[in-house]
């Protein structure tokens, strides 16, 4: 028996076509993507083919002015119209809380949406009762196939799932699952979840019964044969785990941004076993044309958005000086408010002993574009933000050792004064620079604000210590020459939409004013600093 | 939370007829399929016949096809069993079940809510 298996993951609000970076669509005849090329693609193979599952794992919501506009609403409303077959709840579908996924998305969805491992408690377990399950049983032609759904534990940290849902161990919560679907019968089991590639693969290898795995979270690109598109695979399409009880079980996962469509065939005996898989990412680009009357809908739903973007957000009633003259050679103040609402849309209070889990910022002071004038009566709009933070970056936490920390602000200053966008802007950190040492070892002092306290403080970075730092997905990636931290970052997960996070810290704040307060020190002659 | 719950049920003579309803709150119907089953004693349950969820089809099992009649009322959230020419072997307990999905399906296992059963007993 074969069953051929489509699935996405990460798509973040995606819903148009995109460039081939899945920034905004520029040149139509070069975009990819989009809700509308999907479903063509999606019901090609659906009337090619006799039994097709068409999965996602997560992190639909965010990334996006359709999520910022539409707030989920836009999500089930195309998934409807795509027939999704299943999908597993991603850390994301939590960043509006529990009350932004239940309304939009759980009571709306016509498909069944999954997670084993999140458990409700409190009041929340009646309410949101039914609306997610652990596993569903799913009718694929004369046969059945099992799908158990999973969701990153780290999710509290990367979201705001509230107080009344518990984020269990994924292995331990999906054994019983599983366990159960075998008892009634079901001998084909997906694993479908959110918790990033490595976990996939723990979970191929651990949980018995499992005979595929389809991941989301770590926005894993595999393939096999030469890719079609800029993306690097890590690894063969689908990868291949042996599990300890010595079954081979694929693993796949399909990037990001629905610029793909993952494509994979197994072959199932009469027992349930995987006999056979083979597949890979199908891209999706302009070769494949748009759905017309998908398309019809989002051009209809379009609508909103163009009117949001004029609306006022908030007011400043100072000059937000984002020029490349300031932000490249020295503290600005948009830099500081950027990286200001950066750390208050990470304010997660998990644990009495933190007043807050991460404290800390950096921004490539070239990835901010554009100044915004306090002088058109203060107003701030979604339009002003875009051409401040013109690339559809996040905002994304990760974890590094102290020791990188300072190379990264060494390679910051390293060629200082030729105008390049290395140049650090920070929230949470004091930095001082000596510009007349050599280059990589400018920085004199570098003090940063704690977080296992109760009173913030700034205290000297110390480089065995690991520290979470909010930065952009750019620099995670080693964007602007920060390979240190692409090469030596101990964990990364993607975040929310840049201009989302400064659009919602602007709303919240009504009138802001930010200043240059001395985060950022610089000078060119030697000083009586002693080194750290 | 979701709730299904049966009614209808009775004594009835064969070749007589019954209607069960199955009232659901907690969710919308239409995003709904849903199927009745029935457990004679001593049987394993069995689909009897399923309505998709946009209504537009619905299966039935052979033992039934031609006497029974499913039909919804999404306004009232209301399922229907129509049940003609019954015979002595349709009795049982009847269970309304719904689930989210595409494909309607007469097999117990893809059903996630059940309801608590209503019974029916065909005899003279």
């Known amino acids: 028996w074969e069953l051929t298996i489509l699935h996405t993951n990460d798509v973040h609000s995606r819903l148009e076509q995109t460039s081939e970076d899945s920034s905004k669509c520029v040149n139509a005849s070069r975009c990819m993507g989009g809700v509308a090329r999907l479903f063509t693609k999606v019901q090609q193979i659906r009337r090619a083919e006799p039994n097709v599952l068409l999965l996602d794992a997560g992190d639909q919501y965010q990334g996006t002015i359709w999520f910022t506009v539409y707030k989920g609403a836009e999500v089930a409303h195309f998934m409807n119209a795509l027939r999704y077959d299943a999908m597993a709840l991603g850390n994301h579908e939590f960043d509006n809380g529990v009350e932004g996924l239940i309304e939009p998305l759980l009571k709306e969805a016509k498909f069944p949406i999954l997670s084993a491992n999140i458990k409700a408690k409190g009041p929340l377990a009646s309410q949101i009762s039914g609306l997610y399950l652990p596993y569903k049983v799913l009718p694929v032609g004369d046969e059945v196939v099992g799908i158990v759904g999973y969701t990153s534990k780290e999710t509290p940290f990367l979201s705001n799932p509230g107080t009344n849902l518990v984020f269990e161990d994924e292995i331990t919560a999906l054994q019983p699952e599983v366990d159960k679907l075998k008892t009634l019968n079901v001998n084909k089991i997906i694993a479908l979840g959110h918790s990033g590639f490595e976990m996939d693969k723990l979970i191929a290898q651990k949980v018995r019964g499992v005979d595929v795995v389809v991941g989301g979270h770590s926005n894993t690109f595999l393939y096999t044969g030469n890719p079609p598109s800029k993306e690097v695979p890590a690894g063969k399409y689908p990868f291949i785990v042996t599990s300890d009880d010595g079954r081979k079980v694929p693993v796949v996962q399909a990037y990001a941004f629905g610029k793909y469509l993952g494509y994979l065939k197994i072959e199932f005996d009469e027992r349930g076993n995987v006999i056979s898989s083979h597949g890979n990412p199908i891209l999706l680009n302009s070769s494949i044309p748009e759905d017309p009357s998908i398309k019809a809908d989002i051009n209809k739903w379009r609508i909103k958005l163009d009117n949001y973007s004029t609306q006022e957000l908030g007011k400043t009633i100072v000059y937000l000086d984002g020029s490349s003259q300031s932000c490249r050679f020295r503290e600005c103040n948009m830099g500081n408010l950027i990286c200001d609402a950066m750390i208050n849309n990470n304010l997660r209070h998990t644990d009495e002993m933190f007043w807050n889990h991460v404290s800390m910022c950096i921004l490539n002071g070239g990835g901010i574009r554009s100044p915004i004038d306090e002088r058109n009566n203060g107003t701030i709009t979604w339009e002003n933000l875009a051409a401040v933070l013109p690339f559809g970056g996040t905002f994304d936490l990760v974890q590094l050792k102290g020791s990188t920390l300072k190379k990264a602000f060494e390679h910051s200053v390293h060629r200082y004064g030729q105008s390049t966008g290395e140049f650090l802007q920070v929230g949470g950190i004091h930095v001082v620079y000596d510009l007349s040492r050599k280059p990589g070892d400018r920085v004199v002092k570098l003090d940063v604000l704690c977080t296992k306290c109760r009173v913030p403080s700034y205290d000297p970075l110390k480089m065995d210590e690991v520290y979470k730092v909010i930065l952009p997905n750019f620099l995670a990636n080693g964007g602007d020459g920060f390979q240190m931290i692409k090469d030596e970052l101990l964990r990364h997960d993607s975040g929310d939409q840049d201009i989302n996070v400064v659009s919602t810290y602007i709303s919240k704040m009504k009138v802001i004013y930010p200043a240059v307060e001395g985060r950022i020190k610089a000078h060119h002659h030697h000083h009586h600093h002693h080194h750290h | 939370a979701l709730q299904l719950v049966e009614s209808g049920g009775g004594l009835v003579q064969p070749g007589g007829s019954l209607r069960l309803s199955c009232e659901v709150s907690g969710f919308t119907l239409d995003y709904y399929n849903i199927g009745w089953f029935r457990q004679a004693p001593g049987k394993e349950r069995e689909g009897v016949s399923c309505?998709?969820?946009?209504?537009?089809?619905?299966y039935y099992a052979d033992s039934v096809k031609g006497r029974f009649t499913i039909s919804r009322d999404n306004a009232k959230n209301t399922v229907y069993l129509q049940m003609n020419s019954l015979k002595p072997e349709d009795t049982g307990v009847y269970y309304c079940?719904?689930?989210?999905?595409?494909?309607?399906?007469?097999?117990?296992?893809?059903?996630?809510?059940w309801g608590q059963g209503t019974e029916v007993t065909v005899s003279s």
């Open positions: 079940a719904a689930y989210r999905g595409w494909h309607p399906s007469l097999d117990a296992r893809v059903y996630d809510y």
């Open positions: 309505s998709s969820a946009s209504g537009g089809s619905t």
